[in-house]
Structure formats: C-alpha cells, structure tokens
C-alpha cells in the first residue's frame, strides 16, 4: 500500500530571464527513494540517482542545474518554459510517486510564488 505524499512548490511564477527552483518532497512513507526524475511535459530534464548522482539531459545542460537537494534550478527562463513540470520519485517497495508543479514565466516584473500544496 502506498502511503506517501508528495509536497511541491505548487503553482509558481517567475520573470523572464530569471531563475526558479523546483522542489518536491516525499513524506509519510519509509520507502527508499532510488531515483528522482524531473520532466517537463514529456521531456526528461534531469535524473538524480541514489547511486550515480545527477544526469542532466544534454539539451538542457546550459539552463538546468541540480539542487538544492533533490530540487532542480531552471535558469535563463523564457516564456516557452511556461507549463507543467513533474517530479517522479521511484521508490522501493512502494513504487512511483509523482508531483506536479505549474510554472508561469511572466514578461512583467510582477512574479509571485504560489503556496505549497500536497498531492496524495
């Protein structure tokens, strides 16, 4: 039975040209996290493997950086970066947990962070 929940940074906004940290946290389970995948729609951005460390997809290498922790930092944001991002936690023995973050990249200087929310 999967008892865990993923807490994410929720719906967030950031300015064009700036940077943003995407963060998820898996709680309420004793399952061992073996790998975390970060995806944008159907594109793989990065993988953090418990044994092998980080792998950043070559097409994002100049704009994506690992951390803090299991989070992901996106730099030099463009309006095309607006959309859904997913953190996919591979765990043993529970299986897979997925968290969703929606990022809106704004032209203006009015960019505010949304509240955290939980996904069961």
């Amino acid at each position: 039975m999967m008892t865990g929940t993923i807490e994410t940074t929720g719906n967030i906004s950031a300015e064009k040209g700036g940077s943003i940290i995407l963060q998820c946290h898996l709680s309420s389970t004793t399952a061992q996290v073996t790998q975390v995948n970060w995806e944008q729609q159907d594109q793989l951005l990065a993988i953090c493997n418990a044994d092998l460390g980080w792998h950043i997809s070559p097409s994002f290498k100049d704009r994506v950086a690992p951390g803090p922790g299991l989070g992901l930092t996106l730099q030099s944001l463009t309006v095309n970066d607006t959309g859904e991002y997913f953190c996919i936690y591979h765990t043993y023995p529970d299986g897979t947990y997925t968290g969703r973050i929606f990022l809106e990249v704004l032209e203006s200087s009015v960019a505010e962070h949304g509240a955290r929310f939980q996904i069961p």
Epitope: H25, S27, A50, W54
Partner: antibody, heavy 117, light 106 residues
Framework: QAYLQQSGAELVRSGASVKMSCKAS????????MHWVKQTPGQGLEWIGY????????NYNQKFKDKATLTADTSSSTAYMQISSLTSEDSAVYFC??????????WGQGTSVTVSS | QIVLTQSPAIMSASPGEKVTMTCSAS?????MHWYQQKSGTSPKRWIY???KLASGVPARFSGSGSGTSYSLTLSSMEAEDAATYYC?????????FGVGTKLELK
C-alpha cells in the same frame, strides 16, 4: 569509494587571498554537487555554497557571495575555492563535501586557514 | 534564513542509556539531515531525509520529526557514540546548520 583530498593548511596575511583545492576520486566528478562549508569554534558549521561541475553552475550563501569564488576543473576532477580580502574572521577550517541529492555524503579532511595581521 | 536551534548544547549519557536530542527550526522545513563529528575529524553524514540512516550507522540511531521540530534518538548509548551532532536543513536557501549537540560518555 568516493574520496576527497583537500590541500594543506594555509597561513596568510590579512587582506590577501587564498585558493584551496579539493581533488575528487572514486566517482564521476560531473554528476555531483560540490559544497564548501566553513567551521569555526564560535559559529559552528556554515554553508558557503556549491558548484555543479557538470556545467559550472554555482549557488552561494549570500553572506559569502563577495567573499568566496567557487570553480571546478573537470579535467583533473578538482574543485577550488578562493577566499578574498582575508580578515581574522576568515580564520577557520574549510571543508569540501560531495552531495548528490541525499545530503553531503563524503567530506574532505578540511583545510585550515589562519589569517595573520 | 532559517535558524536551527539544537538542544541541549551539551549532554552526557552512561553506557546503555537512551539519548534524545532535538533540532528546532525557526520556520517549517520539509526534512532534516544529521551529521556526526568527532574531534579533529570531518563531519559524517549520519541521518538524512529526517529518518534514513546513512551507510554504516548503527541501528540504535533513529531520526524523526516534521515541521519545525526534529529529533535524533539513540536507543542505547555506547562509547563510540560520543561526538557532536549537527542538524542541517535545505528547505530554504541558504542551507543552515544547527550549532551542534555535544554528546559525552558519562
């Protein structure tokens, strides 16, 4: 087995700069963040910042933004930290530490920096 | 920045005694890491993600907590456990450490 070898102790003049190294072995250098941590008897452990050698990205504690500069040489699997405009407050032991998402799992032995006036 | 307050600052325990030390955060954090450091040596990752024991850490250690309150518990003190233990958070930039709890053998 990962291993981090730091450069030797430094005795430096106030106002000068110092550059210390952290040579990594036993793992893929470009797949892990390299953190730097300052330890003093009074302040305990303080996080300075980290560099991701895979693309050179750096993330600094604002307190050390104008004090420390982090770099990495992937050809030699070595991370560096330069500390500028040294004062007595910079006298400390500085550690490098590897981190791949699950806290800092391997630490160097530390580099002691003593600033003399 | 988030301030981590560890208590007690210093404590002593007899062999076999149960030990609990706490780490209180000035704002809510999602998880806590703990490091063990013995005099003259580097810190070692001890407990990560609040409750997971690092490789080689004896099962007599455990970690728990949520929000602003976290703890490290040692079910039965042994001589080799005498050390300073630091908590660390990275739910918020910059990462911060507590000032440490020094655990001595009585």
């Amino acid at each position: 087995q990962a291993y981090l070898q730091q450069s030797g102790a430094e005795l430096v003049r106030s106002g000068a700069s110092v550059k210390m190294s952290c040579k990594a072995s036993g793992y893929t250098f470009t797949s892990y963040n390299m953190h730097w941590v300052k330890q003093t008897p009074g302040q305990g452990l303080e996080w300075i910042g980290y560099i991701y050698p895979g693309n050179g990205y750096t993330n600094y504690n604002q307190k050390f933004k104008d004090k420390a500069t982090l770099t990495a040489d992937t050809s030699s699997s070595t991370a560096y930290m330069q500390i500028s405009s040294l004062t007595s407050e910079d006298s400390a032991v500085y550690f490098c530490a590897r981190e791949g998402g699950w806290a800092m799992d391997y630490w160097g032995q530390g580099t002691s920096v003593t600033v003399s006036s | 920045q988030i301030v981590l307050t560890q208590s007690p600052a210093i404590m002593s325990a007899s062999p076999g005694e149960k030990v609990t030390m706490t780490c209180s955060a000035s704002s809510s954090v999602s998880q806590m890491h703990w490091y063990q450091q013995k005099s003259g040596t580097s810190p070692k990752r001890w407990i990560y993600d609040t409750s997971k024991l690092a490789s080689g850490v004896p099962a007599r250690f455990s970690g728990s907590g949520s929000g602003t309150s976290y703890s490290l518990t040692l079910s039965s003190m042994e001589a080799e456990d005498a050390a300073t233990y630091y908590c660390q958070q990275w739910s918020s930039n910059p990462s911060t450490f507590g000032v440490g709890t020094k655990l001595e053998l009585k």
